[in-house]
């Protein structure tokens, strides 16, 4: 039994780091392998992660960690029974993938403006809380070419856009993801998407519609 692709890990900079690797053949990761991880200099016993299968030869392990300090460095030992397959280290602050934002809501109660809000995935005492910026993706369910990204570079988890910039009378979906420049993170996963119907009417169209209506009377 050998490691084909060495473990690579990313941290959410809060409580979980995820390590993935590939073996040289089909493996029952949870019964055959253990990933031991320990903070460098920590005097108490190493923690053990039981991996899960991630495809035939792939394994994934979710390492439970205390709130992360930027200088934290972990030793990683991958064992198959009594055999040490791989030894490495992992510094969470250098491999951050933020948690995905949540609670994405589209507020359509203001006639000419769409307000999108979402929740910051970190508590206020986490370093990333004040360092996230976001990308909002809006697309049309009817027209694959109607696909746009809005970069939100300020801290407030919200975006205002003119309803008139979207096509009227059709359904749109939106999703949001986050990253933090300070730790040169990767992008988070996208949030779950939310759907709404863009019923905005141009003022001229509204006027024209009303005029036509009266004409019928």
């Amino acid at each position: 039994m050998k490691v084909l692709q060495e473990p690579t890990c990313v941290s959410d900079y809060m409580s979980i780091s995820t390590c993935e690797w590939k073996m040289n053949g089909p493996t029952n990761c949870s019964t055959e392998l253990r990933l031991l991880y320990q903070l460098v200099f920590l005097l108490s016993e190493a923690h053990t992660c039981i991996p899960e299968n991630n495809g035939g030869a792939g394994c994934v392990c979710h390492l439970l960690m205390d709130d992360v300090v930027s200088a934290d460095n972990y030793t990683l030992d991958l064992w198959a029974g009594q055999q040490l397959l791989w030894k490495g280290s992992f510094k969470p602050s250098e491999h951050v993938k933020p948690r995905a934002p949540g609670n994405l809501t589209v507020h359509t109660n203001v006639s000419d403006t769409l307000l999108l809000t979402w929740s910051n995935p970190y508590p206020p005492d986490n370093y990333l809380y004040n360092h996230l910026t976001y990308a909002v993706n809006i697309w049309s369910e009817n027209d694959p070419a109607d696909f746009r990204i809005y970069n939100v570079t300020y801290l407030e988890p919200s975006l205002r856009i003119a309803a008139s910039t979207l096509k009227s009378g059709i359904s749109y979906r939106a999703r949001v993801r986050a990253w933090a420049q300070c730790y040169n993170t990767t992008w988070s996963e996208w949030s779950p998407s939310t759907k709404w119907h863009n019923s905005y009417r141009e003022p001229f169209e509204q006027h024209h519609h009303h005029h036509h209506h009266h004409h019928h009377h």
């Epitope: 920590l42 005097l43 108490s44 016993e45 960690m65 205390d66 300090v69």
Partner: antibody
């Protein structure tokens, strides 16, 4: 309930030796790092010895290096501190403390045993 | 070794008041800092780790903050059981971890 109970303290002459013990209960002793911390009469705290969970790694400050030895017997759930070539400045209350599972802070302390070095 | 300097060495306060104790490290220790409380005649008790995370069972009137070299422990609405001595301790790097000199908090 986590309990750490120190014993072995007492009055000893300068240059003498003493061995302190700490009986641990209420947790899986063999998985925790342990330490000895002393509190001098002026109430200052000093970490005098640390040992990792399996006993393979120990550490001491310069003030006691070569004179103090920390050891553990995981089968007996007991931590030890062998002190030799004692000096008057070693007079203190000696506490046994357990290292937190996820950080090197000390989450449980014993009630302490008093060591007095005097002629 | 990294030196830890606590201030003030002592302070008097009344029940209900808010107090802040500070701890300064001689070099960057990131957030590798713990706080302990010691009542007269008792052993120290674990209060805070990682500079800001409360240990299990510690009341929310306690809060830790800071990183790098400057740290503080704040106690809101002091209770009678809060009086005693407080110590900071760093645990950065190899195990030559040092304590601050302590702060004695007395009832006014």
């Amino acid at each position: 309930e986590v309990q750490l109970v120190e014993s072995g303290g007492g009055l000893v002459q300068p240059g003498g030796s003493l061995k302190l013990s700490c009986a641990a209960s209420g947790f899986t002793f063999s998985t925790y790092g342990m330490s000895w911390v002393r509190q001098t009469p002026d109430k200052r705290l000093e970490l005098v010895a640390t040992i990792n969970s399996n006993g393979g790694s120990t550490n001491y400050p310069d003030s006691v290096k070569g004179r103090f030895t920390i050891s553990r017997d995981n089968a007996k759930n007991t931590l030890y501190l062998q002190m030799s070539s004692l000096k008057s400045e070693d007079t203190a209350m000696y506490y046994c403390a357990r290292f937190f599972r996820i950080r090197n802070a000390m989450d449980y302390w014993g009630q302490g045993t008093s060591v007095t070095v005097s002629s | 070794d990294i030196q830890m300097t606590q201030s003030p060495a002592s302070l008097s306060a009344s029940v209900g008041e808010t107090v802040t104790i500070t701890c300064r490290a001689s070099e960057n220790i990131y957030s590798y800092l713990a706080w302990y409380q010691q009542k007269q005649g008792k052993s120290p008790q674990f209060l805070v780790y990682n500079a800001k995370t409360l240990a299990e069972g510690v009341p929310s009137r306690f809060s830790g903050s800071g990183s790098g070299t400057q740290f503080s422990l704040k106690i809101n609405s002091l209770q009678p059981e809060d009086f005693g001595s407080y110590y900071c301790q760093h645990y950065y790097g190899t195990p030559t971890w040092t304590f601050g000199g302590g702060t004695k908090l007395e009832i006014k």
